[in-house]
């Protein structure tokens, strides 16, 4: 009996530019002889419904169709037919199929590969064209993929130390697509500093599929309107 096992759940998520290993394990009732077996990896893009060959291993000879694609011949002996792709790109997401032939038997498995890019976040203070006592803080998130992203603003005062979400005076712009396929977006918070308590901590909170925990950038409102503590300047402002 010949069986192929791929990633549990049928989906693998990998960061952009990572050296990804797409799992494929072979289970066979007898010891594997790699000189008399064949492995073929296929890829079907998300954008066009055509399956193309990425890698082929047959009779101890291997052929890479994508630069750097490789199945370790050493690991193959113990049934590991995982495909390694260095420097994975957004466009290489899609369905990967591992086909194993141990004559006369054939087995295959498929997995969806999702390529994600984590956002980088920075805070900026924009005072251009603002009225007296009014400040505009911009939270820029850049280089993320997929497009779906959630940006919120929170504040913590000395009276209420638990974060409170701010819903007023927040404007989040449209997502902009970069040349490399990733996205950028900016969210703005308008503050009237005369109506806010000094010591209030404001946070821009970014949630994205690529992040295990939200990305937080913060600033503290001080008595002197625009002065920021050194730690805030160093850690959160570019």
């Amino acid at each position: 009996d010949l069986k192929v096992e791929m990633m549990a759940g049928g989906t693998q998520i990998t960061p952009l530019n990572d050296n990804v290993t797409i799992f494929c394990n072979i289970f066979y009732s007898q010891p594997l002889n790699i000189t008399s077996m064949g492995i073929t990896w296929f890829w079907k893009s998300l954008t066009f419904d055509k399956e193309v060959k990425v890698f082929e291993f047959f009779g101890d000879h291997q052929e890479a169709f994508r630069p750097g694609a490789i199945v370790s011949p050493w690991r193959l002996k113990s049934g590991d037919a995982s495909l390694r792709l260095p420097g994975i790109q957004l466009e290489e997401a899609g369905e990967y199929r591992c086909e194993v032939v141990v004559t006369p038997l054939k087995a295959q498995g498929t997995v969806q590969l999702e390529v994600v890019a984590s956002p980088a976040s920075r805070l900026l203070l924009d005072q251009v064209g603002m009225k007296e006592n009014e400040d505009k803080y911009m939270c820029e998130s850049s280089g993320f993929y997929p497009e779906a992203i959630n940006i919120t603003w929170e504040k913590q005062t000395q009276k209420f130390p638990h974060p409170i979400e701010i819903s007023e005076d927040v404007i989040t712009g449209p997502t902009i697509k970069n040349m490399d396929g990733t996205f950028n977006v900016t969210s703005c918070l308008k503050l009237n500093s005369s109506q806010e308590d000094p010591g209030t901590v404001y946070q821009c909170v970014v949630r994205h599929a690529s992040l295990h925990t939200p990305l937080r950038s913060n600033f503290t409102l001080t008595a002197a309107r625009h002065s920021l503590s050194e730690t805030e300047k160093t850690d959160n402002f570019s």
Partner: antibody
């Protein structure tokens, strides 16, 4: 038989652009990747980028982003690399290559010498 | 980027000699190491891939070994046609990088 035939030598002025070609045969071009590499006289090789002919998707070495631009013409099975804002540092032999048995650069073109001189 | 270092830039040997060319990576490249031969006319071909696997049609006098950061190419019985420059290349991480090359000459 897999073949990659590159265009002839180029003498160009600083600031100009040059477009090199790599005509292929012996394999299915539309589902292949073509890489470009640079070798300055008497020096080592540098990987510039690759292009997937099926979609035109590219992957660049950051060092060459903005300097090199890769394109393909599937009807003639030809890959192109345009090098812009040339300086004397760009004087080199440029190779096209495609992956094969175990290697990202298994089949090579004969190289094109580009000389940048005023 | 991963730096590849070939400490010997040129090497002189006699026909029939056993020649070893070494290559060091700036970090562990997990055996993703290929060797190329460049003839004086500029022609390039692959000799070895994945550290030790002989490319189709390459004579068996060529062999490769190594692990981690240190790798070597051995020519067991040097022939006239082996006069060339040899480059190592890491295939572990993009951008792919090459060693500076070792030029092999006849004594």
């Amino acid at each position: 038989q897999i073949q990659l035939q590159q265009s002839g030598p180029e003498l160009v002025k600083p600031g100009a652009s040059v477009k090199l070609s790599c005509k292929t045969s012996g394999f299915t071009f539309s589902s292949s990747y073509i890489s470009w590499l640079k070798q300055k006289p008497g020096q080592s090789l540098e990987w510039i980028a690759w292009i997937y002919a099926g979609t035109g998707n590219t992957n660049y070495n950051q060092k060459f982003t903005g300097k090199a631009q890769l394109t393909v013409d599937t009807s003639s099975s030809t890959a192109y690399m345009q090098f812009s804002s040339l300086t004397t540092e760009d004087s080199a032999i440029y190779y096209c290559a495609r992956p094969g048995e175990g290697s990202p650069f298994a089949y090579w073109g004969q190289g094109t010498l580009v000389t940048v001189s005023a | 980027d991963i730096q590849m270092t070939q400490t010997t830039s040129s090497l002189s040997a006699s026909l029939g000699d056993r020649v070893t060319i070494s290559c060091r990576a700036s970090q562990d490249i997990s055996n993703y190491l290929n060797w190329y031969q460049q003839k004086p006319d500029g022609t390039v071909k692959v000799l070895i891939y994945y550290t030790s696997r002989l490319y189709s049609g390459v004579p068996s006098r060529f062999s490769g070994s190594g692990s981690g950061t240190d790798y070597s190419l051995t020519i067991s019985n040097l022939e006239q046609e082996d006069i060339a420059t040899y480059f190592c290349q890491q295939g572990d991480t993009l951008p792919y990088t090459f060693g500076g090359g070792t030029k092999l000459e006849i004594k």
